[in-house]
């Protein structure tokens, strides 16, 4: 009787379990009673990543430099391109269609993660004892300068966008 | 159904060229299926020639050498065979076939 | 080319009883996906041939599940479990794995 169900790596139709073509190739005809399933490779701007009975191959993706990207690995005839951001940018979503430019942390925020060709900065607020006075994609919040260390006093104390002021002590006379 | 239809002279000299052509019916000959000639000389074993497949691209039985050729025209949805410099061994009935479907067969006579 | 030897090339069988034939190749007809194209057919008086069994034990459409085929490799066997009037004629294997395809010689079944 006809097959109503394939083994893996076959596909049923016409009544026949014809095997299904290899990643890196793509359907030219189906089997028959007397032939075996043909295929082809794909095109060297094309890939297919599955065992599959697709007739035409995917596109590679293109890294687009006008939005930002670049290639990270190039495509072979069973993988897709892989792109990612130039310097200084990272990716918008994860399938990383185009860049955006990384964030700063603002003042009173540190860096607690730099940004990579797919994700953002990560910015912190600055603890008590920790301050950051500019707005940066890649620094932390600093600590506040240690005044009793130079031998001196806190004269203003600080805050988390600002150091705190030394200044010599009082001399009782 | 898938039908075929053998046609062409039932009588060819020796020397001459043999030509016979296969009408299909009931399904298009430019999808999966190889599409042969087969022979069968009088009281005697079932001989393949030859096919050509849905692309064009054919495949010959090398004791042919180089006298057969089979063609396609995929507007008539129909195939052909050509076999040159024929002799008296020639003789047989001939078929064209799909394998799972036969036309009825010709009987081709060389001779003079 | 493969060879297919075929018996026995005759076979007289009594109407309601068992019809084995043999068909042996030169070479195995597994190919390197593990399909092997050998195909049984029958040819009645005057007929075309008519497909009943491909790839080794795949009856064909419409043929009576009293035929089955059986084998691997280079053995192969047709058998009729209950032969039937209709049943005479001649039946080849031919194998399609390699090319030039090839044909058995025939094994002739008559009724006693």
């Known amino acids: 009787e006809p097959p109503t169900a394939c083994r893996e790596k076959q596909y049923l139709i016409n009544s026949q379990c014809c095997s299904l073509c290899q990643p890196g190739q793509k359907l030219v005809s189906d089997c028959t009673e007397f032939t075996e399933t043909e295929c082809l490779p794909c095109s060297e701007s094309e890939f297919l990543d599955t065992w599959n009975r697709e007739t035409r191959c995917h596109q590679h993706k293109y890294c687009d430099p006008n939005l930002g990207l670049r290639v990270q690995q190039k495509g072979t005839s069973e993988t897709d391109t892989i792109c990612t951001c130039e310097e200084g940018l990272h990716c918008m979503s994860e399938s990383c269609e185009s860049c955006v430019p990384h964030r700063s942390c603002l003042p009173g925020f540190g860096v607690k993660q730099i940004a990579t060709g797919v994700s953002d900065t990560i910015c912190e607020p600055c603890p008590v004892g920790f301050f950051s006075n500019v707005s940066s994609a890649f620094e932390k919040c600093r600590p506040w300068t240690s005044c009793e260390t130079k031998d001196l006093v806190v004269q203003q104390a600080g805050t988390n966008k600002t150091d705190v002021v030394c200044g010599p002590q009082d001399r009782q006379r | 159904q898938v039908q075929l239809q053998e046609s062409g002279p039932g009588l060819v000299k020796p020397s001459d060229t043999l030509s016979l052509t296969c009408a299909v019916s009931?399904?298009?000959?430019?999808?999966?299926?190889?599409w042969n000639w087969i022979r069968q000389p009088p009281g005697n074993k079932l001989e393949w020639m030859g096919y050509?497949?849905?692309?064009?691209?054919?495949n010959y039985n090398p004791s042919l050498k180089n006298r057969i050729t089979i063609s396609v025209d995929t507007s008539k949805n129909q195939f052909s065979l050509k076999l040159s410099s024929v002799t008296a061994v020639d003789t047989a009935v001939y078929y064209c076939?799909?394998?799972?479907?036969w036309g009825q067969g010709t009987l081709v006579t060389v001779s003079s | 080319d493969v060879v297919l030897t075929q018996s026995p090339l005759s076979l007289p069988v009594t109407l309601g009883q068992p019809a084995s034939i043999s068909c042996r190749s030169s070479?195995?007809?597994?190919?390197?996906?593990?399909?092997?194209?050998l195909n049984w057919f029958q040819q009645r008086p005057g007929q075309s041939p008519r497909l009943l069994i491909y790839?080794?034990?795949n009856r064909f459409s419409g043929v009576p599940d009293r035929f089955s085929g059986s084998g691997s490799g280079t053995d192969f066997t047709l058998k009729i479990s209950r032969v039937e009037a209709e049943d005479v004629g001649v039946y080849f294997c031919?194998?399609?794995?390699?090319?030039?395809?090839?044909f058995g010689s025939g094994t002739k079944l008559e009724i006693k």
């Open positions: 076939a799909r394998l799972d479907y």
């Open positions: 009931g399904y298009s000959i430019t999808t999966n299926y190889y």
């Open positions: 050509i497949k849905y692309d064009g691209s054919n």
């Open positions: 070479q195995s007809l597994e190919n390197s996906n593990g399909n092997t194209f």
């Open positions: 790839k080794v034990s």
């Open positions: 031919l194998q399609v794995t390699h090319v030039p395809f090839t």
